[in-house]
């Protein structure tokens, strides 16, 4: 019998510091560019190698970007929200949800993760 | 894993025209940015044209601007490049780049760095 898969959602406040070369990561989303279906969120697509989110270690692909400096990030368009995070300022606090995909045991069984019961 | 296959590419007259094809893979193509680099014989890899994930904005070396145009059909997961007026000096192997999302720092569309996926190329002959 198939495991089923959840998700365990954590939330976290990531400083950053602006290195050299920028905050060192691109991002998906937005009202005119929708990633994941019924979610006109902002999320990581890449995070470049010895930039400043690469060398914090925190921030990973597929992270959704909950705000950048207190500002909400819901409702932008793609290109408002990459022209926040350029114009955030050196020190940079980013509020982010992480989606950790947890296998469960077969299905009927409350396996190790599972909220339920 | 994005995979870039490009075409059209083979002999062309100066002066004529060709227009070269990249098929990407993938069900977020519309947040692909992309771009064609090129590199003849013993020579360096080339920026040539870039162009961002809705196509409003384009760039071009300056050795091709005016000449050849980038473009892009999101609901055909496909970028071109339309070479009018080619130059012998314009013969190489065009390839493809891609990388998925926009930057949040300065974009560099020259820098081959910006792009995590590339194609094979197509070889573009101008007589």
């Known amino acids: 019998m198939n495991g089923r898969v959840d998700y365990l959602v954590t939330e976290e406040e990531i400083n950053l510091t602006r290195g050299p070369s920028g905050l060192g990561f691109n991002i998906v989303g937005g009202t005119d560019q929708q990633y994941v279906s019924n979610d006109s969120g902002i999320y990581v697509s890449r995070i470049k190698e010895n930039g400043a989110a690469a060398l914090d270690g925190r921030l990973q692909e597929g992270d959704k970007i909950l705000s950048v400096n207190g500002q909400d990030l819901k409702n932008l368009l793609h290109q408002d929200a990459v022209d926040l995070f350029r114009n955030a300022g050196y020190a940079v606090s980013l509020r982010v949800q992480h989606r950790l995909q947890v296998q469960n045991g077969p299905i009927g069984h409350r396996g190790e993760g599972d909220p339920s019961g | 894993e994005v995979q870039l296959v490009e075409s059209g590419g083979g002999l062309v007259q100066a002066g004529g025209s060709l227009r070269l094809s990249c098929a990407a893979s993938?069900?977020?193509?519309?947040?692909?940015?992309m771009a064609w680099f090129r590199q003849a014989p013993g020579k360096e890899r080339e920026f040539v044209a870039a162009i961002n994930w809705s196509g409003s904005s384009t760039y071009y070396a300056d050795s091709v601007k005016g000449r050849f145009t980038i473009s892009r059909d999101n609901a055909k997961n496909t970028v071109y490049l339309q070479m009018n007026s080619p130059k012998p000096e314009d013969t190489a192997v065009y390839v493809c780049a891609a990388v998925i999302g926009s930057t949040v720092d300065e974009y560099r569309p020259s820098d081959p760095l910006e792009y995590d996926y590339w194609g094979q190329g197509t070889q573009v002959t101008v007589s």
């Open positions: 993938g069900r977020t193509f519309s947040t692909y940015e």
